[in-house]
């Protein structure tokens, strides 16, 4: 099956202090390789979450990525701050034998807009 990374929401708005879910699904787990979430693109992009076991404060996976045939790589960001605003991308990599993993496909991005907390 052809690999496609889908981020269904173009944008989400969230009040500061609340949590938000960023959805991402894959049509195939092949080729073998990790899925990572980034904010921004190019040189300035920031790794937000990686489905490879590391700990990321305030960011958790929504479904159990270790389950066989799981295609849902959505994440939850808790206690959102204005600094979390930006465009988030779900990116699939192909595992390299020795060289670094190769980026092969990305979702279209979800813009996170942080609203002021209602007083």
């Amino acid at each position: 099956k052809e690999l496609k990374v889908t981020q269904p929401e173009k944008s989400v708005s969230v009040a500061a202090g609340d949590s938000t879910v960023l959805n991402c699904t894959l049509t195939s787990l092949l080729p073998v390789g990790p899925i990572k979430w980034y904010r921004g693109v190019g040189q300035s992009r920031l790794l937000i979450y990686s489905f490879t076991g590391e700990h990321f404060p305030r960011v958790t996976n929504v479904s159990d990525a270790t389950k066989r045939n799981n295609m849902d790589f959505s994440i939850r960001i808790s206690n959102v701050t204005p600094e979390d605003a930006g465009t988030y991308y779900c990116v699939k990599f192909q595992k390299g034998p020795s060289e670094p993993d190769t980026e092969i496909q990305s979702g279209g991005g979800t813009e996170v807009y942080v609203l002021a907390k209602p007083s």
Epitope: V41, G108, E111
Partner: antibody, heavy 119, light 108 residues
Framework: DVQLVESGGGVVRPGESLRLSCAAS????????MNWVRQAPGEGLEWVSL????????YYADSVKGRFTISRDNSKNTLYLQMNSLRAEDTAVYYC????????????WGLGTLVTVSS | ETVLTQSPGTLTLSPGERATLTCRAS??????LAWYQEKPGQAPRLLIY???SRATGIPDRFSGSGSGTEFTLTISSLQSEDFAVYYC??????????FGGGTKVEIK
């Protein structure tokens, strides 16, 4: 059929203000993100501003930030662009453009309204 | 911001000829690229999205290809109504959404 009709263009002096309107019909206006795109005489297309269907998410091009305000009235199916502190370089045809419901490209455009800023 | 460079600036061809327009991105936009046609006094018209998918009602003489940083719009056999200005637009890196500078296809 989708119809987008811009109005409000005209000739103004530098520093003055103008308010553009875009009357939309033929689709569920509140469900779609809307944009303003402009084209200076003899130049290419330049994205100006975006507003989400609910009006919560708003973005501006750096060239207009702090001077232009995008808004919408979903009860009137109308998009607005309030343009303050106008400059000669704002002279352009301003198009109202409806975004695709999944991605940020433009399915439908109006015919545009000409704004001329000249002393 | 992702810069899109279109070439050539002007393409002078005769009806029936094949037109090949190129759009290069300063960084990968995967296949998140659209093409538009603009004629004087008319609203711009979406031709291609997702780099290669034709929009509704677009004749099959228009085709798009490419991914990453290199994209092509091909008009297989130019008709009189195809002489216009064509713009590419990326919608991966945003905001801002960016357009190429345009390619004018004119009659020889």
């Amino acid at each position: 059929d989708v119809q987008l009709v811009e109005s409000g263009g005209g000739v103004v002096r530098p520093g003055e203000s103008l308010r553009l309107s875009c009357a939309a019909s033929g689709f569920t206006f509140s469900s779609y993100d809307m944009n303003w795109v402009r084209q200076a005489p003899g130049e290419g297309l330049e994205w100006v501003s975006l507003i989400s269907g609910s009006g919560e998410i708003i973005y501006y091009a750096d060239s207009v930030k702090g001077r232009f305000t995008i808004s919408r009235d979903n009860s009137k199916n109308t998009l607005y662009l309030q343009m303050n502190s106008l400059r000669a370089e704002d002279t352009a045809v301003y198009y109202c453009a409806k975004e695709n419901n999944r991605y940020r490209f433009f399915d439908d455009w109006g015919l545009g309204t000409l704004v001329t800023v000249s002393s | 911001e992702t810069v899109l460079t279109q070439s050539p600036g002007t393409l002078t061809l005769s009806p029936g000829e094949r037109a090949t327009l190129t759009c290069r991105a300063s960084q990968s936009v995967y296949t998140y690229l659209a093409w538009y046609q603009e004629k004087p006094g008319q609203a711009p018209r979406l031709l291609i999205y997702g780099a290669s998918s034709r929009a509704t009602g677009i004749p099959d003489r228009f085709s798009g290809s490419g991914s990453g940083t290199e994209f092509t719009l091909t008009i297989s056999s130019l008709q009189s109504e195809d002489f216009a200005v064509y713009y590419c637009q990326q919608y991966y890196d945003r905001p801002p959404l960016t357009f190429g500078g345009g390619t004018k296809v004119e009659i020889k």
